[in-house]
Amino acid sequence: AITEAREEAKPYPLFPGPFPGSLQTDHTPLLSLPHASGYQPALMFSPTQPGRPHTGNVAIPQVTSVESKPLPPLAFKHTVGHIILSEHKGVKFNCSISVPNIYQDTTISWWKDGKELLGAHHAITQFYPDDEVTAIIASFSITSVQRSDNGSYICKMKINNEEIVSDPIYIEVQGLPHFTKQPESMNVTRNTAFNLTCQAVGPPEPVNIFWVQNSSRVNEQPEKSPSVLTVPGLTEMAVFSCEAHNDKGLTVSKGVQINIKAIPSPPTEVSIRNSTAHSILISWVPGFDGYSPFRNCSIQVKEADPLSNGSVMIFNTSALPHLYQIKQLQALANYSIGVSCMNEIGWSAVSPWILASTTEGAPSVAPLNVTVFLNESSDNVDIRWMKPPTKQQDGELVGYRISHVWQSAGISKELLEEVGQNGSRARISVQVHNATCTVRIAAVTRGGVGPFSDPVKIFIPAHGWVDYAPSSTPAPGNADPVLII
């Protein structure tokens, strides 16, 4: 049966009695070898008890003495089998063996849970030589035990290629419960059941769990660890924690907040990032998400003109990146814009409405009745047109852009002329003779350049040809108007 040493027990003597072979307890060792940094493992068995020899792993020496007496089997002496102590306490345990002096270079190594303990442990091996045998005591001490020191420790010795192994010493470090699983924060739907888990371990076991909700115990009598708390549903935020109790006392987990999912708060700080004639780029700062991720957002746009019919345009977009370009708007118009976002629970209220305006638009139609004729005497081309019918939102006409392309054998060049908004005629110098001139005109506002008129072509002859009738914009369906002079 294994003996059990508890921390409350009286300290035991290093040697309860003399070793076999006349070694007395008051003898001082002739040689003491502390293992400082490299070699020897780190734990040592407790008091040596000179009882029956070890029956387990025994080496039978083949050598006999001068008198031809066979040597007894070698084995570690029995020691305490189980040491129970509290965390941060000190412990020392030993294993001992008597080895005939014929053996040289005997070394004891320490092993924990099947792995050799190497490194800077508090391990000391002491040798007590006598006439025939040397008593070897390997001690191991831990100044402040931790849970990680729990385990089974053994001594090993090699003699004659034989391995001698001691009985295990079980070190059980007891302390307050240690949480292996604590409750976690959650966002839950109102009045919907959910589970929280709490698990703590010793030793010592058992560990019992109490649940606490908002500083009140949920269960007045405990549950064995691990414990799952099923909460049938909450209507408001709550904080949960668990207490773990064992024979050493109690510990308390972190408190976790359980939030109730709700509709989000409305977005804030809706702002205009950029405006064009037909689009507005907006951004917003999302409101509180109601403990549930945003799914998407809705941009609501209504004309601010009191004469409008009050209809609302709705544009849906993803919740990220809090940016949206509203398109297909009228130029030079005022709009009210609001943003609403949704999560799994529902839609937020609409943000405060903001006022935004589109800029002027480019003209939507080209100048009409474009005519081109050659004034040979001045070597100019005269161009005339009619002002296009402009809409209010197209903005104020600031002028016209004239494109004239000159093409002759091997030459093609395009020139652009800007003319003011006053009048509806222009004169351009002939650039190339014996060439075709193609003219197009576009109206211009601050909003941009409108569409170009259909091309009108006129042939510019070599010097000395007769000036004929002008070329003009064809009626719809006619072929390209080209006047050959």
Epitope: L176, P204, E243, H245, K248, G249
Partner: antibody, heavy 121, light 112 residues
Framework: QIQLVQSGPELKKPGETVKISCKAS????????MSWVKQAPGKNLKWMGW????????TYADDFKGRFAFSLETSATTAYLQINNLTNEDSATYFC??????????????WGQGTTLTVSS | DVVMTQTPLTLSVTIGQPASISCKSS???????????LNWLLQRPGQSPKRLMY???KLDSGVPDRFTGSGSGTDFTLKISRVEAEDLGVYYC?????????FGGGTKLEIK
């Protein structure tokens, strides 16, 4: 050695408030709880409830909900029992006892010497 | 609440003689974990209570083995094989299985 030392006897008038202390030594205060037990003259011991010395979470038996409050001064390793709006029925000896839930159930292993409260007009 | 009933109220015993105290509960004290949380306290004259026994029959450290506990369900007994002078005082049983914890009325052990 673990010791629980309670404050001295109290003489109070009905309607007043009393606060009894229980000073712990010899152990880590926050690793256990403290129970309070009432012993009225000629009556049973009556468990009033307990407080977790780490978290301050209290549990009260039904008869002691309302006027009774457990509290802590962790830095002073002291637990308190406060009784408000005292009545004559509160006259009793009040004990504190170290408490937590071990393998044998509620521990109740170390007790204070008791504080005698007399409520009289 | 669980009612704990102790008998007798007073027990007069000669030193060296045995003594027996009964404790009955109004509900079974067998918990769902298989344990029975029935405990005994001793309050010596002028002192605070001291834990004597827990889980029906387990002695607290330092309690002499002349004390034994037995019983199950709702019926429990504390026995002292040979009463000594230091044993006098009031013995209380109490239960920790159900909330709230409740105490018996106490049995006063006096020396004849």
């Amino acid at each position: 050695q673990i010791q629980l030392v309670q404050s001295g006897p109290e003489l109070k008038k009905p309607g007043e408030t009393v606060k009894i202390s229980c000073k712990a030594s010899g152990n880590t205060f926050t690793t256990y709880g403290m129970s309070w037990v009432k012993q009225a003259p000629g009556k049973n011991l009556k468990w009033m409830g307990w407080i977790n010395n780490y978290s301050g979470v209290s549990t009260y038996a039904d008869d002691f909900k309302g006027r009774f409050a457990f509290s802590l001064e962790t830095s002073a390793t002291t637990a308190y029992l406060q009784i408000n709006n005292l009545t004559n029925e509160d006259s009793a000896t009040y004990f504190c006892a170290r408490d937590y839930y071990g393998s044998g159930g509620w521990v109740f292993d170390y007790w204070g010497q008791g504080t005698t409260l007399t409520v009289s007009s | 609440d669980v009612v704990m009933t102790q008998t007798p109220l007073t027990l007069s015993v000669t030193i060296g003689q045995p003594a027996s105290i009964s404790c009955k509960s109004s509900q079974s004290l067998l918990d769902s974990d298989g344990k029975t949380y029935l405990n005994w306290l001793l309050q010596r004259p002028g002192q605070s209570p001291k834990r004597l026994m827990y889980l029906v029959s387990k002695l607290d450290s330092g309690v002499p083995d002349r004390f034994t506990g037995s019983g199950s369900g709702t019926d429990f007994t504390l026995k002292i094989s040979r009463v000594e002078a230091e044993d006098l005082g009031v013995y209380y049983c109490w239960q920790g299985t159900h909330f709230p914890r409740t105490f018996g009325g106490g049995t006063k052990l006096e020396i004849k």
